[in-house]
Every structure is written in structure tokens, then in C-alpha cells.
Interface confidence: low
């Protein structure tokens, strides 16, 4: 059928909670393309009716919630004027009890993440939540070994749990819990995180602080030029690397052919106790596939993202 096949890594998912997967594969999706989702090589596309438990939402496939029978290979077909790519995603649904079934604790965990905290440092855990704009996420609650996290060393900041003065006792099983609202219905998302402790501080031994972005979204019109600064404070003697990434790839490499999105030249200002670094990302022209994609600013072990979103329609104009 003339489509190029691309195989993604398997996704292990927990039953009974929402899950979404975004079909973006730049530079394939960087032009005028149509995206259609299918299940198990079916000729019938996944429904686009938002009331359906499984439906396509723009470039996303959305499960509200995931169920046992949803395991399988899903294909997203990206058709351009002169190209066709078929991306295969293997989703495996499983039942996982995070707490003992005898203990009244948390519900089942979704995809388990592995994260590292640095001993003696101020560090953070991130609750990875990737859903389309139609899903509204509430504030996050954090748990360790089935108990809600308390104590003055812990601060919840949007999608992050800040941990000050990390100790060896901070290793273990964590979970972040959030209420997702979609079309008036509420669902619970619970992500498990296995946390290990390391004494080795990334690169230069300091943990940089990303002042901006703050895992926030930016409203931007399609087709416009956008420049976003990543502002980082770090010790004067640091050797940390600072860069912008998308899908775990340097933006300059990711958009190597089109050069539509580029990382800028790093600048810094020197203060008494620290340096303030700025490295920007430039979108020469914002395209549809940029929306909903986390563009990550990295600084040593720290990371924070911006996500572009279309402005809400201004009905007063009609």
C-alpha cells in the first residue's frame, strides 16, 4: 500500500485508567498531513466520537479508560501529499496492585517510571502526564509506599514533587495521582515511579534550577514565529550541559533537515552567588504538530518543558 512502517517500543499500561498516545513523528508530521488511528490492522478507523471510550482526538488516541481487552498493536497512519507512514505501537494492558490487596491503599498503577534523586541535594520527581488538550488535569497528589507524602522537605509544584536534602530513606515506590476531566466525566490517573538514590551529582556536582519554563503551556497562533527562553541558575563553577530537546533528541538534530526549530546561542549573566544562563528555542513557523508536544529544556539533571497550545477561539469576532 506504499506506506513506510515504523515500529515504536512497547508500552506497558495499567487497566482501569486513562491513557493517551500522540501520533507525532517529525519531520514526517511537519507538513500538511492527515492522521488516522487503527487497531490490529483493522480497516475501520478508531472512532472520532468523543463519547466513545476509545477515540481519536486530533493526532492522539485516547482511552477513557484503558481496559483488559485493549491490548494489541495500534497503527497510526500519517498521509501527506507525497508520503505515507504507518507507525505501530504495541500496547500491553496489565493489572498491577501497587499496595497489598489486603491494605486499603491506592488503585492500580499505570506505566511505571524509574527516576533518580541525588543524595544530599535538592531534587525533584516528575509526574509524566501526556494527554490531549481536551483532558483537563487537576492538582497532583503524591504517595510513597501507599501513604500520602507529608513533611516540610516535600513541596508539590505543578507536575513535580520537590524534595529538599535528599536522604537514603527517600528511595522506594512513589505514585502521583491526578483527576482527569474529559467531557464532564472524571477519571483517576495514577502513575507509579520507582525511585533510586545516587551520590553522583550530574556532571559538575550541582543541581541547576530552571527558573523558566515551569512545565507550562504557551498559547500561540499557527504559523507564527516564537522564541522561548530557558532561564537557568547554576553555580559559577558548574560544568552542566544546557540544551533544548524534543522526544529525547536535541532539537537541532530532530529538525536537522527543515531547521524550522533551532536552539539559540547560550548567554549568561554573572551574579554574586551564581550564574544565570539563557538558552532559547526558536520556532521559525509554528505548525500543527508542535502543539501538545513537550519541548524540554535540560540543564544537567534538571529539566522542564513548554507545550504549545492553540489559543481558545475568540467568539466575539463572529
Amino acid at each position: 500500500d506504499g506506506c513506510n512502517d515504523i515500529f515504536m517500543k512497547n508500552e506497558m499500561l495499567s487497566a482501569s485508567q486513562p491513557f493517551a498516545f500522540n501520533c507525532t513523528f517529525p519531520p514526517i508530521t511537519s507538513g500538511e498531513v492527515s492522521v488516522t488511528w487503527y487497531k490490529n490492522s483493522s480497516k475501520i478507523p478508531v472512532s472520532k466520537i468523543i463519547q466513545s471510550r476509545i477515540h481519536q482526538d486530533e493526532t492522539w488516541i485516547l482511552f477513557l479508560p484503558m481496559e483488559w481487552g485493549d491490548s494489541g498493536v495500534y497503527q497510526c497512519v500519517i498521509k501527506g501529499r507525497d508520503s505515507c507512514h504507518r507507525i505501530h505501537v504495541n500496547l500491553t494492558v496489565f493489572e498491577k496492585q501497587w499496595c497489598d490487596t489486603s491494605v486499603k491503599g491506592l488503585p492500580n498503577l499505570s506505566d511505571e517510571y524509574k527516576q533518580i534523586l541525588h543524595l544530599g541535594k535538592d531534587d525533584s520527581l516528575t509526574c509524566h502526564l501526556h494527554f490531549p488538550k481536551s483532558c483537563i488535569l487537576g492538582p497532583i497528589k503524591w504517595y510513597k509506599d501507599c501513604n500520602e507524602i507529608t513533611g516540610e522537605r516535600f513541596t508539590v509544584l505543578e507536575t513535580r514533587l520537590l524534595v529538599s536534602n535528599v536522604s537514603a530513606e527517600d528511595r522506594g515506590n512513589y505514585a502521583c495521582q491526578v483527576i482527569l476531566t474529559h467531557s464532564g466525566k472524571q477519571y483517576e490517573v495514577l502513575n507509579g515511579i520507582t525511585v533510586s538514590i545516587t551520590e553522583r551529582a550530574g556532571y559538575g556536582g550541582s543541581v541547576p534550577k530552571i527558573i523558566y519554563p515551569k512545565n507550562n503551556s504557551i498559547e500561540v497562533q499557527l504559523g507564527t514565529t516564537l522564541i522561548v527562553d530557558c532561564n537557568i541558575t547554576d553555580t559559577k563553577d558548574n560544568t552542566n550541559l544546557r540544551c533544548w530537546r524534543v522526544n529525547n533528541t536535541l532539537v537541532d538534530d530532530y529538525y536537522n533537515e527543515s531547521k524550522r526549530i533551532r536552539e539559540g546561542v547560550e548567554t549568561h549573566a554573572s551574579f554574586r552567588e551564581y550564574n544565570l544562563y539563557t538558552v532559547n528555542i526558536t520556532f521559525l513557523e509554528v505548525k500543527m504538530e508542535d502543539y501538545g508536544l513537550p519541548f524540554m529544556c535540560h540543564a544537567g539533571v534538571s529539566a522542564a518543558y513548554i507545550m504549545l497550545q492553540l489559543p481558545a477561539p475568540d467568539f466575539r469576532a463572529y
Partner: antibody, heavy 120, light 106 residues
């Protein structure tokens, strides 16, 4: 420096809808919690609700059936609407937010407050 | 709802006095927040996460407590400290304030 400024009519008739705007400068409402609180004359503070950076809203159950908090990120403003007002809704209304130097919960930045009187 | 009860409701004291304001919650709360409010002004965050002083708050102020009982203490009262103080909990919604303690000059 983060600044918040409430605006809206100071007088609202009973049974009508109270509408207030909070204009934010020095911070983006696409981060953090953006709260409304009121202070009844001679009484204490009452928490009304918030809109979260994601658009999620929380309302105090005692007001939930009458209150709506919304936002316009392009204007960096968020809004309070309180319907079917009575004299008991006469109060100074404040918008407030936390700050990254603190925890998001802590209401560090406040507007100066706007007095809304419900009277015919 | 968690009820927050401050005591005393009002307090007359002299400059130099040591003053303690208590806030009791009807259920356990993780942290307490304290605000200072002067007439015609917006409240100011005074103490956060039970014992942390907000920016610009003098060191004569301190906060302590856990569970259902929390206190704000002024070690040596100064003229600018006369105001109303509110406690607040963010542990369980709805997020409730105490009724306030009015600190007046004797």
C-alpha cells in the same frame, strides 16, 4: 514583581450576578494556582475557589452551585462570577496566588481587594 | 469540613509582651499557614508550612505545631504587630480559615 488587581462593579443588585476580573502582571496564569478569597465586613476570610494552571477549577462546596471561575490566558486575567447574590455576599473580594519562592498553596501575592455591596 | 478555631478571638497586650495565638483544627492538618491583616489592607502571608517566616517577617515571630494544634508566637510585641492574624489549612478542601485573632494595644 507579581501584581494582582481586582476590578468590577462595586454595587450589585440582589439576585443578580457578581462579576470580577483579576488582572495579573509579572507572572503567567499558565503556571500555579489562581485563587479568590473574600472578607465579609467585620468577619473573617472565606476561601471561594481557584483555577489551576491546567484550567482545572475548584470551588468551595458552600458556594459551588453559584460560583464560576474562568480565565483568559491571552489577557493574563482570571474571573469570578457569583450568581443569585444576596446581602450575605457583601464583602471585600481578593484575588491571590502563591509564588515559586514559596509553596503554591501559600497565598503570597494578593490584590488590594475590591468591596462589592449587594443592595437594591 | 475542617473547622479552624482561633483563640483568643481578641487580645490586648503591651509593647514588649510575649504573645501566643493558638489555632485548633477539627481534624489533623499537615501544615498551618498564618496571615496578618491590617484595617483596609489585603492580608499578607506571614508564616507558611507551619514554621517558615515569609519574606520580610521579623524573626520575633515563630510558628509551631502539628496535628490539630498550631501556634503563632511573638517573642516581644512591637507597635507594628498590632493587627488581625488568621490561620488557614490547605490540607483538605474546602480550604478553611480561622475566624481571626485581633491583637490590640492595651
Amino acid at each position: 514583581q507579581v501584581q494582582l488587581q481586582e476590578s468590577g462593579p462595586g454595587l450589585v443588585k440582589p439576585s443578580q450576578t457578581l462579576s470580577l476580573t483579576c488582572t495579573v502582571s509579572g507572572a503567567s496564569i499558565t503556571s500555579g494556582y489562581w485563587n479568590w478569597i473574600r472578607n465579609h465586613p467585620g468577619k473573617g476570610l472565606e476561601y471561594i475557589g481557584y483555577i489551576y494552571y491546567s484550567g482545572y477549577t475548584y470551588y468551595n462546596p458552600s458556594l459551588k452551585s453559584r460560583v464560576t471561575i474562568s480565565r483568559d490566558t491571552s489577557k493574563n486575567q482570571y474571573y469570578l462570577k457569583l450568581s443569585s447574590v444576596t446581602a450575605a455576599d457583601t464583602a471585600v473580594y481578593y484575588c491571590a496566588t502563591g509564588g515559586y519562592d514559596y509553596v503554591e498553596d501559600a497565598l503570597y501575592y494578593w490584590g488590594q481587594g475590591t468591596l462589592v455591596t449587594v443592595s437594591s | 469540613d475542617i473547622q479552624m478555631t482561633q483563640s483568643p478571638s481578641s487580645l490586648s497586650a503591651s509593647v514588649g509582651d510575649r504573645v501566643t495565638i493558638t489555632c485548633r483544627a477539627s481534624s489533623n492538618v499537615r501544615y498551618m499557614y498564618w496571615y496578618q491583616q491590617k484595617p483596609g489592607k489585603a492580608p499578607k502571608l506571614w508564616i507558611y508550612l507551619t514554621s517558615n517566616l515569609a519574606s520580610g517577617v521579623p524573626s520575633r515571630f515563630s510558628g509551631s505545631g502539628s496535628g490539630t494544634s498550631y501556634t503563632l508566637t511573638i517573642s516581644s510585641l512591637q507597635p507594628e504587630d498590632f493587627a488581625t492574624y488568621y490561620c488557614q489549612q490547605f490540607t483538605t478542601s474546602p480550604y478553611t480559615f480561622g475566624q481571626g485573632t485581633k491583637l490590640e494595644i492595651k
